[in-house]
Amino acid sequence: GSGIFQLRLQEFVNQRGMLANGQSCEPGCRTFFRICLKHFQATFSEGPCTFGNVSTPVLGTNSFVVRDKNSGSGRNPLQLPFNFTWPGTFSLNIQAWHTPGDDLRPETSPGNSLISQIIIQGSLAVGKIWRTDEQNDTLTRLSYSYRVICSDNYYGESCSRLCKKRDDHFGHYECQPDGSLSCLPGWTGKYCDQPICLSGCHEQNGYCSKPDECICRPGWQGRLCNECIPHNGCRHGTCSIPWQCACDEGWGGLFCDQDLNYCTHHSPCKNGSTCSNSGPKGYTCTCLPGYTGEHCELGLSKCASNPCRNGGSCKDQENSYHCLCPPGYYGQHCEHSTLTCADSPCFNGGSCRERNQGSSYACECPPNFTGSNCEKKVDRCTSNPCANGGQCQNRGPSRTCRCRPGFTGTHCELHISDCARSPCAHGGTCHDLENGPVCTCPAGFSGRRCEVRITHDACASGPCFNGATCYTGLSPNNFVCNCPYGFVGSRCEFPVGLPPSFPWVA
């Protein structure tokens, strides 16, 4: 503790100029004071001034008023500093002395004589209010006041609480009258060293180093750090926790970049054809009559469907066609006959059967021939049976579909996984992606197909934390940490209680 006992001398009256022994001062009592402050004693005794002592220079002769003086010799109020906890009680002895000697240092002069003394014993609380008193004896009167105040930076009832205002990283505060800390605006905590973050800043996902700030922890973003950051490279997906990539409807794959609903998103089929999804970015267009091509973008000749029967020849017109019928036939499609079996109308070994009592006929055609008169060789490719751009080829009595790369099946209707060919060497794991297969390589291998044995193993230093499995080769000199349940991050260093995560490319 630390404080100051202050004594203000106000007026001393010694009208007759007498000493305590009854003698008078000649030519007058040149008066100075000795003050002794000590611990409380019921009966004041001689002995050390345990709380301090002080002397004044000569302040006046016989009777005088003492003026306040802030510095130098004759300072008033008198200061008695102490470096302990103020006990609240004290004993004070004020003695008035006459000196024949030096005005400034009468204490050192020989022949000093006591004029009078007063003793005060009691309690005194720390405070700024002066306690005023007056003491009389038969010869003298002394008016004075006193108080105890704390030294700078000391506070409390006994000046025992040290507090120094500060504004640095170990505290941002001022001191209350009782010595407790009063945090500056924007700061909190026992020592006012914790900043108050931006209002609404997420308690777990954000923090701050100064007031009204919100710095996001890894995996979070936004003004209040309440928005998660999805998996790096996530295209058509969202997250509810960091590094997640939950695919939007119609999308799939590690990065939600594989289109599972190509038909809806891209409408690739033209001219009213029907689109059918068939796996990531796969689709099939079923054309309306009169159209062909992978996207039914090609308009067929109106005669392409061979509408003219019985050997009639077809001629294209602007929005239609016209059938030129051979002798013995008539109608829009030459479908009506004027012939009978007697006219041997069936070609290519077809058998003629009479109908309607011989007024018409029907031909029964041998294999590989068709038409009303068996005049047409069967073309099994006219119905465009091959899907996904496959080429149709007649093979005698049957036909085959020659499929484009990536498709298989009788009609090329099946999409082949790029990974089915096992393109990854050395035990690499294959992933079907938009631009072809991607291989995740085991430790010690890299390259697009894990075909390169690497001398520097990026996994050798053990970069993955929390029991994660390390892979290399996803891209040159990189590694992948496959995190166990409950950890995410490039090195699986963040515990977030996630479902098992995707590998993270470091």
Partner: antibody, heavy 121, light 104 residues
Framework: EVQLQESGPGLVKPSETLSLTCTVS??????????WGWIRQPPGKGLEWIGD???????YYNPSLKSRVTISVDTSKNQFSLKLSSVTAADTAVYYC?????????????WGQGTLVTVSS | SYELTQPPSVSVSPGQTASITCSGD??????VSWYQQKPGQSPVLVIY???ERPSGIPERFSGSNSGDTATLTISGTQAMDEADYYC?????????FGSGTKVT
Amino acid sequence: EVQLQESGPGLVKPSETLSLTCTVSGGSISSGSYYWGWIRQPPGKGLEWIGDIYYTGSTYYNPSLKSRVTISVDTSKNQFSLKLSSVTAADTAVYYCARQAVMYGGGSDNWGQGTLVTVSS
Amino acid sequence: SYELTQPPSVSVSPGQTASITCSGDSLGDKYVSWYQQKPGQSPVLVIYEDSERPSGIPERFSGSNSGDTATLTISGTQAMDEADYYCQAWDSETGVFGSGTKVT
């Protein structure tokens, strides 16, 4: 009991960067009650405060060294580091890492044993 | 920049009182820490916040700070107290050490 241990090369060439790491054991560097500081002492001379860092990454540097100093923290490893660039012979010193307690008004109540770094070609 | 000045050396007889001063502009308005450093060892905090002793520091070490001067007092000095002593204060966000005093 918390212990601090400095590590790093004992010899650095002039104009290069001095790099030291302080590993904290027996307690978490993420405690909000402490700042983690670097102090150096040239041979036969007094102590010089270099700078300190809070676990969140807030840094404070000695203005006389600020342009050359970087202090960083890795809470996952319970470590903090010092980098001092463009060193000269005047940077030869014993480098200490220390824990500065908020409750002690910034007093350093825990020190590493120190590591001597000599700058010489 | 802020500076703290200490006497280079102080001599004391065993059992006597040693006083080490540390002066700086308005130092009494700042908290002062004191460190003891023996040869070949790391510094040890002996006083913080002007006059507080960390646990394990003997009662013979005490401190005070007012005006422009802080003082470390070692009463009943022992041979084991022979060491270098440094004062330290914070000026804004910067740590400042005194020049050090060798006590023999």
